[in-house]
Every structure is written in C-alpha cells, then in structure tokens.
C-alpha cells in the first residue's frame, strides 16, 4: 500500500528555521504535492506550498524555499521569525497526488523535546482520499 512519510526538523544552524521533508513510497508518478500546516489541506490547514512537476512551484510565507528533492520527495524550508512563525508543536501535512494510486496524505510535527538538528521520527499515516 502506498504511504507518505513526513519529517520535521529544526535546523541547528538557524534555530528559527524549520525543514519539512515529505516523500511518497508508492510506485506511481507524482502529479502534485501540497504542503500545509495546522492540519490537512482542506480540513482547516493553511497551504504553504504547491509543487507541480511541470508547472513549477508556488509558495506562501513563511515558506522560504520549496524544492523537488527527487521525483518522489520534496523539501520545504520555513522562516521561523515573525508573527506567522511555526512553533515546536505545529502540525505539517503533505498530500501527494499520484497516478494511478490517487491522493495520499500524512502529517508530522517536531516533538517539543527535540534538540535542534534532530528530526521528528517519520510519520507515515496515509489517508486515502478518493479525489
């Protein structure tokens, strides 16, 4: 069964900066990735970035840099300073639309006890959506 993994890490070199990494474990091809925070996309979450393999990448503050790492994984760097900055227990979600598997989503957050430079354990908690 396809799964999505999510990692969240506070960078040791920039304590106000978060890196979110997400990946798709299915064998299909990714047609769209949506990264949100505060909950799943469409269920109270706020979109941070949308990555399309052909049409490019759109991102919204406090997202600083979104990129395709590989064909099946992405990363997003968030600026942590300012009113819209994430806190340690913020939930980040990644939704992958793939062919032929459909849409899969998982969420993760940085544990409050995490040391800078350490990442949250990956949280493959797929939600099959019949989009």
């Amino acid at each position: 069964t396809p799964e999505v993994w999510v990692q969240v890490r506070m960078e040791a070199t920039e304590l106000s900066s978060f890196t979110i990494r997400c990946g798709f474990l299915g064998s299909g091809s990714i047609s769209l990735v949506t990264v949100s925070w505060g909950g799943p996309n469409g269920a109270g979450g706020t979109t941070l970035a949308v990555l399309h393999p052909e049409r490019g990448i759109r991102q919204w503050a406090p997202a600083r840099q979104a990129r395709w790492e590989t064909q099946s994984s992405i990363s997003l760097i968030l600026e942590g300073s300012g009113a819209s900055s994430p806190c340690a227990n913020t939930t980040f979600c990644c939704k992958f639309a793939s062919f032929p598997e459909g849409s899969w989503e998982a969420c993760g957050s940085l544990p409050p006890s995490s040391d800078p430079g350490l990442s949250a354990p990956p949280t493959p908690a797929p939600i099959l959506r019949a989009d």
């Epitope: 990692q7 990494r21 990946g23 395709w68 590989t70 064909q71």
Partner: antibody, heavy 123, light 108 residues
Framework: QIQLVQSGPELKKPGETVKISCKAS????????MSWVKQAPGKGLKWMGW????????TYADDFEGRFAFSLETSVSTAYLQINNLKNEDTATYFC????????????????WGTGTTVTVSS | DIVLTQSPAIMSASPGEKVSMTCSAS???SSWYLHWYQQKSGASPK???????NLASGVPARFSGSGSGTSYSLTISSVEAEDAATYYC?????????FGSGTKLEIK
C-alpha cells in the same frame, strides 16, 4: 538486476553535436529521476543536472545551461544527453546516474551509475 | 556555491590500519544531503554512503560515515587491499549540487 548501459565512445570535431544514450533496465524507469555527471580526464566529478523521467522537466547546473540538453524516450527506458557546438573542454567521460528516490535518511544520492561514455573533441 | 574540500588529497595505508578522510563544506550542509562515492581506476563511481552515515547496499561494515554542519568524515576501521580507490563526497543541500575533489586511498 538494475543497470544503466550507455552508448559507445565518440570522437567529434569542435562545433559538432553529440548525443549520448543511457538505457535503463531492471526497474520502473519513470519512477526515478536521471542525473548526468561529467568527469574530465584525470579530474573529479561535476554534477550537470537531472531530468524528471515522468514529466520530462530538466534542471541544469549553471555551467551546463545552453549547449546541453537532456531528453527521454520513455517507451524504451532511455535517457539522452545532447551537447551542441562542442568545445575542446567538453572532452570528458559522461555518466548517467539514477537519482535515488529519497527517504527519511537522505536525498540527492546517485544510487546506480551508468557505464560512462567518453567524448573526445579534437580538430 | 557550496565548496567541498576533501583532505588529504592522497593517503597511503597498510592493510589492517584505521583511516579517516574528511570533507569540509564552505557552508552548512544538512546531514540528509551529504553522500560519499567510491571510484576505482577506469570504473564508474559507486554510491558508498548516503545521508552522512548510511552504508549503500553491499558496502562492508568496516566503512562508516559521520559528521554534521560543515564537517564530515568517512572512516575505514581496518583497511583492505580492495579499498584502494578515490572517494568523493557530494552535497545536495543547495544548487549547484557539488562534489569534493576526492581523496585517493593507496594501499601499501
């Protein structure tokens, strides 16, 4: 077994064009990106960029913008590198290399390498 | 551009010796994005260590990788003759994705 088999050596003159092939086998071609790496004689490795084998979108390193083009023929699981207007400094071995899928332990590693194609540019 | 400086450029070791080589980055690289490759003379490179410390398939357990930030290393606990090769580090932290200049390991 997973393999990337590249086309044979090429001897070209300055100003000519070369097209190198990289045929993949043993895995689903469109699931992994394909990278290209240059190695000049006696020198180190230089990342040229990669192509998304599903969308066909290419990303080039700055030094390889312009004269270099990645392309695909997915029906035969083959990636191509074309170099236009060849220069003497293009003399090198060119490797295709599969861009690993990425995991919780890392990303951006090249987990399978091609056999290499030597291109010699000389007048 | 992130410049990766490998040292030493060339090193020589006897079988059974412990050796370490370093890869120093001009700016910080996340451990997720630091990898090592082995290339023997006349052959294609092979992925050796990925994500700083994970051994690629088939790599002997005498190899290990460690580091963070701007300083990374590859260690061989007990060198064998078959380890003679050039080892390259590579970063995928920021574009352009660069390789180090390599450390050539010779066996006495």
């Amino acid at each position: 077994q997973i393999q990337l088999v590249q086309s044979g050596p090429e001897l070209k003159k300055p100003g000519e064009t070369v097209k190198i092939s990289c045929k993949a086998s043993g895995y689903t071609f469109t699931t992994y990106g394909m990278s290209w790496v240059k190695q000049a004689p006696g020198k180190g490795l230089k990342w040229m960029g990669w192509i998304n084998t599903y969308s066909g979108v290419s990303t080039y390193a700055d030094d390889f913008e312009g004269r270099f083009a990645f392309s695909l023929e997915t029906s035969v699981s083959t990636a191509y590198l074309q170099i236009n207007n060849l220069k003497n400094e293009d003399t090198a071995t060119y490797f295709c290399a599969r861009l690993g899928r990425g995991s919780t332990t890392g990303a951006g590693y090249l987990d399978v390498w091609g056999t290499g194609t030597t291109v010699t540019v000389s007048s | 551009d992130i410049v990766l400086t490998q040292s030493p450029a060339i090193m020589s070791a006897s079988p059974g010796e412990k050796v370490s080589m370093t890869c120093s980055a001009s700016s910080s690289v996340s451990s997720w994005y630091l990898h090592w490759y082995q290339q023997k003379s006349g052959a294609s490179p092979k992925l050796w260590i990925y994500g700083t410390s994970n051994l690629a398939s088939g790599v002997p357990a005498r190899f290990s990788g460690s580091g963070s930030g701007t300083s990374y290393s590859l260690t061989i606990s007990s060198v064998e003759a078959e380890d003679a090769a050039t080892y390259y580090c590579q970063q995928y932290h920021s574009d352009p994705y660069t390789f180090g200049s390599g450390t050539k390991l010779e066996i006495k």
